[in-house]
Interface confidence: medium
């Protein structure tokens, strides 16, 4: 559906609401809700980030 349409999502889509802001919106992502600690490596570290860390926002 076109942006702003009220058509329901396609069948089988996850029941979690889509929290992405509308196109062009300046609303920031939902910060502070991640359950992961700050997993960015220490400065100067060559270690890779921890496995599967997708919920910790990297704001660098």
């Amino acid at each position: 559906p076109a942006p702003g349409s009220t058509a329901p999502p396609a069948h089988g889509v996850t029941s979690a609401p889509d929290t992405r802001p509308a196109p062009g919106s300046t609303a920031p992502p939902a910060h502070g809700v991640t359950s992961a600690p700050d997993t960015r490596p220490a400065p100067g570290s060559t270690a890779p980030p921890a496995h599967g860390v997708t919920s910790a926002p990297d704001t660098r």
Partner: antibody, heavy 117, light 110 residues
């Protein structure tokens, strides 16, 4: 060279208040979540509080034992993190450390808090 | 309350490989617990060794490595040195708070 320097500890009576400070250098402080951890002979190491980034609206989390009594805050312009401690109890006695970065890479030397009458 | 359990004491010899473990009372430790390992030397000198289960902090010798072994987090020192004698703490993340273990006193007989 990364450094974390705590200050503000001392002797306080039960029910009293105290504010600890930690100044960081050697890394981009504003990019990293910071924690306070305390150590006592009775409880060993105990995580106290965490503060996230400006982009996280400076979200905070606390250990159950200090919720409602302690407040963590930060001033990125001063590369500093603080711990305001109110209604102190004898069991809050210990050495308090600020620590952080991926996730406890760096530690200060600690500042001692003694709660006693 | 969640309890994180470590061996109270271990003894090794220089050049040997020793593994310290960290168990959670909630069940298996996973990468979502972001296991950390911290070393304490005399006079309350703390140094972070491992973050996020297996990431070495800057300047930490390669002989220190973090992993998951079975249902526990583990710190392995491959080729222990006398200067590795210290107390080692693990910390586990539980959604919005950390819990530290009681520490393992490692003795390196020289």
């Amino acid at each position: 060279q990364v450094q974390l320097q705590e200050s503000g500890g001392g002797l306080v009576q039960p029910g009293g208040s105290m504010k600890l400070s930690c100044v960081a250098s050697g890394f981009t402080f504003s990019n990293y979540w910071m924690n306070w951890v305390r150590q006592s002979p009775e409880k060993g190491l105990e995580w106290v509080a965490e503060i996230r980034l400006k982009s996280n609206n400076y979200a905070t989390h606390y250990a159950e034992s200090v919720k409602g009594r302690f407040t963590i805050s930060r001033d990125d312009s001063k590369s500093s993190v603080y711990l305001q401690m109110n209604n102190l109890r004898a069991e809050d006695t210990g050495i308090y450390y600020c620590t952080g970065v991926g996730q406890f890479a760096y530690w200060g030397q600690g500042t001692t808090v003694t709660v006693s009458s | 309350d969640i309890v994180v359990t470590q061996e109270s004491a271990l003894t090794t010899s220089p050049g040997e490989t020793v593994t310290l473990t960290c168990r959670s009372s909630t069940g298996a430790v996973t990468t979502s617990n972001y296991a950390n390992w911290v070393q304490e030397k005399p006079d309350h000198l703390f140094t972070g060794l491992i973050g996020g289960t297996n990431n070495r902090a800057p300047g930490v010798p390669a002989r220190f490595s973090g992993s998951l072994i079975g249902d526990k987090a583990a710190l392995t020192i491959t080729g222990a040195q006398t200067e590795d004698e210290a107390i080692y703490f693990c910390a586990l993340w539980y959604s919005n708070h950390w819990v530290f273990g009681g520490g393992t006193k490692l003795t390196v007989l020289g």
